[in-house]
């Protein structure tokens, strides 16, 4: 969490970003809030980036003002115009790229005064794993599959039995690059697997973490997985 | 076709001052940001300066900041870079570079000499 | 500022051979990187950015990739036309800065 103050003759006003994470082709949210004004018109938001000539966004007596938008960003770019009063100042990037990474500001004027504060935002792809037994094996086998990863991640599996126990003799984990050639597929297999047992496989890398468990009883298959961003945290 | 012609260049007492110019044709100027990068004698490259579409905003190198100012008339579809308090370090090939549709330096002009020199 | 070291600054090659020139970046970059061609006597002519996208009209012998802090101009079959100076610039962060080039030239 970023807390900025503005710095003018006019009054500060308090400013708060948090840093996040973009997933690569999707959309993502730059989040900036601030202290609210009560006329719509006298707020001018606008979004800056390290290393961008133009501006990646600016909202100001009650609309997008886009003359001195950067070329990177046309288009993809909106503002949360009906939050705005309430004091949302975050921004929706769409179709987020690689690139996009990097030291935004949300620089924000009102009648109360002048405020800034900096978002570290990052760019990744990260998906759920899905795992499954793998009945083409020729012993009791599971693979996990996550269809988009980038950076390159760690995979680990990991048993409630065997807790603690190292599979990385008896696993095995691939990348495939995917046609965009940005992000990657990740397989891992897992050999020798016993039933009436839970197995996890976690992906990692900077950006996000994500578990697929599978549970396999000789009646059933219960399946689970979940993903965190890492490192969101607010200025 | 996106053209970029420089011109301006010349042999400049130190302390001395210059104005190039970019006339730039083919594309929507207005749009893009435009920089100013010289290559000096032995081939190093240096971003000198960048101008944002709409002209609000500017960025230079520290060692040209207060020294090089960068404009530009959409009206005209010019940039421009005066240079002020010249030094022989500042000799160089200076080269007006357009932002694309893809990135900061998608198109290179044929570039201006600049010699600063006793 | 961000320091691009490039390299090597230069090398020898046979038509046909597949070189690969690399930039380090001195922190990560994110992708925000492009390759230039300078030919002798000439201006620039942009060949890859972002990385890994190639510029329209640029020979598909060209192809860039990395990720972080290292990228590399790898150019598959070399042509007679290839011979020429290479080099690297980033776009991350002000001030943009550039590698110290690459020569390449007919062994």
């Known amino acids: 969490l970023i807390i900025g103050f503005g710095i003018s003759g006019r009054h500060s006003i308090t400013v708060t970003t948090v840093a996040s994470a973009g997933n690569i082709g999707e959309d993502g949210i730059l989040s900036c809030t601030f202290e609210p004004d009560i006329k719509l018109s006298d707020i001018v938001i606008q979004w800056l980036k390290e290393g961008v000539l133009g501006l990646v966004h600016e909202f100001k007596e009650g609309k997008d003002e886009l003359s001195e938008q950067d070329e990177m960003f046309r288009g993809r770019t909106a503002v949360f115009a009906d939050q705005v009063i309430v004091g949302n100042a975050s921004l929706r990037l769409k179709n987020v790229q690689l690139t996009d990474a990097g030291t935004y500001k949300c620089y924000i004027i009102t009648s109360k005064g002048k405020g800034n504060a900096n978002l570290e935002y990052k760019t990744g792809a990260f998906s759920m794993p899905e795992v499954n037994v793998d009945y083409n094996a020729s012993s009791e086998t599971l693979r996990c599959e996550a269809p988009r990863w980038f950076p390159q991640p760690t995979v680990v599996w990991a048993s409630q039995v065997d807790q603690g126990a190292n599979f990385s003799e008896v696993s095995n984990t691939s990348f495939e690059l995917n046609s965009e050639n940005v992000t990657m597929k990740v397989v891992s297999v897992l050999y020798n697997v016993t039933i009436n047992n839970t197995y996890s496989c976690m992906i990692e890398n900077d950006i996000a973490k994500a578990t697929g468990d599978i549970k396999v009883t000789e009646s059933e298959i219960k399946r689970r997985s979940h993903l965190q961003l890492l490192n969101s945290k607010a200025s | 076709e996106v053209q970029l012609v420089e011109s301006g260049g010349g042999l400049v007492k130190p302390g001395g001052s210059l104005k190039l110019s970019c006339a730039a044709s083919g594309f929507t100027f207005s749009r893009y940001g435009m920089s100013w990068v010289r290559q000096t004698p032995e081939k190093r490259l240096e971003w000198v300066a960048g101008i944002n579409g709409g002209g609000s905003y500017t960025y230079y190198l520290d060692t040209v900041k207060g020294r090089f100012t960068i404009s530009r008339d959409n009206s005209r579809n010019t940039l421009y870079l005066q240079m002020s308090s010249l030094r022989s370090e500042d000799t160089a090939m200076y080269y007006c570079v357009s932002q694309g549709s893809n990135y900061y330096f998608d198109y290179w002009g044929q570039g201006t000499t600049l010699t600063v020199s006793s | 500022d961000i320091r691009m070291t490039q390299s090597p600054s230069s090398m020898s090659v046979s038509l046909g051979d597949t070189v690969s020139i690399t930039c380090h970046a001195s922190q990560g970059i994110s992708s925000n990187i492009g390759w230039l061609q300078q030919k002798p006597g000439k201006s620039f002519k942009a060949l890859i950015y972002?990385?890994?996208n190639l510029e329209d009209g640029v020979p598909s012998r060209f192809s860039g990739s990395g990720s972080g802090a290292d990228y590399s101009l790898t150019i598959s079959s070399l042509e007679s036309e290839d011979f020429a100076d290479y080099y690297c610039v980033q776009y991350a962060q002000f001030p943009y800065t550039f590698g110290g080039g690459t020569k390449l030239e007919i062994k």
């Open positions: 972002h990385g890994t």
